[in-house]
Amino acid sequence: TVPPMVNVTRSEASEGNITVTCRASSFYPRNIILTWRQDGVSLSADTQQWGDVLPDGNGTYQTWVATRICRGEEQRFTCYMEHSGNHSTHPVPS
């Protein structure tokens, strides 16, 4: 088992909004849960966009999940990762 490296980034979207992207890379096996939480609970699937789980060329995999949020409310969002029985949460950088 190779645990993922998780990285959260933000980019400007429409006025007053930002897109936050959570990327998991260099993990094996390929089964992974990567999702956004808002206010500590699951963010509905229809407000998230997932990338495919793809090989990254080193025998490991990568994927991502993104959502759009209001600027100033970053604290309310965390990216949740679960892989091979391990869990971690990752805040939006300020």
Epitope: R37, D39, V41, Q75
Partner: antibody, heavy 119, light 107 residues
Framework: DVQLQESGPGLVKPSQSLSLTCTVT?????????WNWIRQFPRNKLEWMGY???????NYNPSLKSRISITRDTSKNQFFLQLISVTTEDTATYYC????????????WGQGTLVTVSA | DIQMTQSPASLSASVGETVTITCRAS??????LAWYQQKQGKSPQLLVY???MLADGVPSRFSASGSGTQYSLKINSLQPEDFGSYYC?????????FGAGTKVEIK
């Protein structure tokens, strides 16, 4: 360490309002987290009532939405529960707690305060 | 709302025994589950979060597992301080709800 302490009257008459205070020490309620009220009925059933978060946003249990209000006094680092039109069914031990945004579980609770609704 | 059904409602066990408590959600909660222990007259204390993760200071004789709608809490070699009530709680969506509890008593 975050510490929470509930206070308020232990006896309320039916149809009146129940008002409780949670005093938080060790952490500013405006810094982060969701600050919650949870109650436990005499037969031990637990019910999440709602929260006010670090920015003042509230979220209530729909079963209570028409009767509940959670407010705060940031200068005193306190948050409050008001429940209107109480009945004997609101007799319970009331706890304040908080959760971080990595997940809505409750790492620490106040010691609880028993409120009896009776004429 | 997601309903949480705990079983058994109560159990009697001896010190040193292994006990298992189960919690069933009315819908898939995707491991968004916590377990608490409550002693008589005290506040609940967090034992487990994210379905399987032990909270700080929780002894390793406690373990938790599950997925989807079915979850369990196992106590190996029950100790005198383990007697009390245990509650599950989901945090998949609002409103947050708790199981009705399992009372673990001394046989």
């Amino acid at each position: 360490d975050v510490q929470l302490q509930e206070s308020g009257p232990g006896l309320v008459k039916p149809s009146q309002s129940l008002s409780l205070t949670c005093t938080v020490t060790g952490y500013s309620i405006t810094s982060d987290y969701a600050w919650n009220w949870i109650r436990q009925f005499p037969r031990n059933k637990l019910e999440w009532m709602g929260y006010i978060n670090y920015s003042g946003t509230t979220n209530y249990n729909p079963s209570l939405k028409s009767r509940i209000s959670i407010t705060r006094d940031t200068s005193k680092n306190q948050f409050f529960l008001q429940l209107i039109s109480v009945t004997t069914e609101d007799t319970a031990t009331y706890y304040c707690s908080y959760y971080r945004y990595d997940g809505a579980w409750f790492p620490y609770w106040g010691q609880g305060t028993l409120v009896t609704v009776s004429a | 709302d997601i309903q949480m059904t705990q079983s058994p409602a109560s159990l009697s066990a001896s010190v040193g025994e292994t006990v298992t408590i189960t919690c069933r959600a009315s819908g898939n909660i995707h491991n968004y589950l916590a377990w608490y222990q409550q002693k008589q007259g005290k506040s609940p204390q967090l034992l487990v979060y994210n379905a399987i993760m032990l909270a700080d200071g929780v002894p390793s004789r406690f373990s938790a597992s599950g997925s989807g709608t079915q979850y369990s809490l196992k106590i190996n070699s029950l100790q005198p301080e383990d007697f009390g009530s245990y509650y599950c709680q989901h945090f998949w969506s609002f409103p947050l709800t708790f199981g009705a509890g399992t009372k673990v008593e001394i046989k």
